[in-house]
Amino acid sequence: MKVLQEPACVSDYMSISTCEWKMGGPTNCSAELRLLYQLVFQSSETHTCVPENNGGVGCVCHLLMDDVVSMDNYTLDLWAGQQLLWKGSFKPSEHVKPRAPGNLTVHTNVSDTVLLTWSNPYPPDNYLYNDLTYAVNIWSENDPAYSRIHNVTYLKPTLRIPASTLKSGISYRARVRAWAQHYNTTWSEWSPSTKWYNSYREPFEQR
């Protein structure tokens, strides 16, 4: 049994780190493998993560962790029974992938404006809470040529779009993702998308 692609891990800077790797051949990850992890810290103990399959040769493990601080460093050992397949380390603060924003809602009852709101995925006491900026992707299933990214660089998780900039009488979808500039993170996954129908019509005298 061999590791083809070494584990690569990212932290959500809250309570979960996700490690993914590829094996040399088809593997029943949960039955054959264990990822052991331990914080480099006085009197810490070893904890075990049972991986799941992620495609034929891919495995993924969700490591339960404490709140992340910059000093934290973990040792990682990938075992197949009594055989040590790989040994490494992981510093969560240096490999952050934020959680995806949630509760994306479209408000169309605001005059002349489409208002999109979503929730910050972190509690106020988390360091990432006040550092997130967002990208909102809006596209149309009726008009495949239409896809826009709106960068939200302010803290408030809202975006206002003049309804007149969208075509009337067709449906649109939106999704949002986040990143934290000062923590040099990657982008989060996209939130689930939300659909709405743009029924806005310009006043007669403006047509």
Partner: antibody, heavy 125, light 112 residues
Framework: EVQLVESGGGLEQPGGSLRLSCAGS????????MTWVRQAPGKGLEWVSS????????YYADSVKGRFTISRDNSKNTLYLQMNSLRAEDTAVYYC??????????????????WGQGTTVTVSS | DIVMTQSPLSLPVTPGEPASISCRSS???????????VDWYLQKSGQSPQLLIY???KRASGVPDRFSGSGSGTDFTLKISRVEAEDVGFYYC?????????FGQGTKLEIK
């Protein structure tokens, strides 16, 4: 009531051995790291050794490394310190103390918040 | 190893007056914001040490509020707002960031 009771001290000749015990009660013993601290006559406190809650990690002062062994039996709620190749400078009162909660991912520290009454070890010919 | 240096080593105090003991570490004991791994212990004559303050400023259970800890990084202070006769004994700071744990030399507090 959370309590630690040491035993096993006594008079031993240089080069001899002693095994100290520390019985814990009133708390979930296996969840906590444990520590031994000693105090030579008229001197200050000196850390000797520590062990994680599951016994997988042990730590020693340079002055006792290779001679002392810390261990625990969680089924008996008891901590041990096996002392071999004893020297005159090991003469001290030995205290066991309850250390950090080590079963969490990052051990939670609340200080050495419970201490035993101490057991006296005298090494002399 | 981290060296802990206490001062003063002897502290005569009048009852009702405040007292202050300083402890300096040879390297930072700050692991993360608000978590300085330094404790303060009191050892009264013929007794086992007892915990007063942990993580720099957190008062242990049952410790009177006249005891307080402060400081961050390498400089720490134990303050007693109004010394009482029962406070006499040796006070030790200890770093618990990692092994080997190290203690200060001890400060003997006595009543004038």
């Amino acid at each position: 009531e959370v309590q630690l009771v040491e035993s096993g001290g006594g008079l031993e000749q240089p080069g001899g051995s002693l095994r100290l015990s520390c019985a814990g009660s009133g708390f979930t013993f296996r969840d906590f790291a444990m520590t031994w601290v000693r105090q030579a006559p008229g001197k200050g406190l000196e850390w000797v050794s520590s062990i994680s809650g599951d016994g997988s990690n042990t730590y020693y002062a340079d002055s006792v490394k290779g001679r002392f062994t810390i261990s625990r039996d969680n089924s008996k709620n008891t901590l041990y310190l096996q002392m071999n190749s004893l020297r005159a400078e090991d003469t001290a009162v030995y205290y066991c103390a309850k250390d950090r909660l080590s079963k969490t991912i990052r051990p939670r520290y609340y200080g050495l918040d419970v201490w035993g009454q101490g057991t006296t070890v005298t090494v002399s010919s | 190893d981290i060296v802990m240096t206490q001062s003063p080593l002897s502290l005569p105090v009048t009852p009702g007056e405040p007292a202050s003991i300083s402890c300096r570490s040879s390297q930072s004991l700050l692991y993360s914001i608000g978590y300085n791994y330094v404790d303060w212990y009191l050892q009264k004559s013929g007794q086992s040490p007892q915990l007063l303050i942990y993580l720099g400023n957190k008062r242990a259970s049952g410790v009177p509020d006249r005891f307080s800890g402060s400081g961050s990084g390498t400089d720490f202070t134990l303050k007693i707002s109004r010394v009482e006769a029962e406070d006499v004994g040796f006070y030790y700071c200890m770093q618990a960031l990692g092994s080997p744990y190290t203690f200060g030399q001890g400060t003997k507090l006595e009543i004038k």
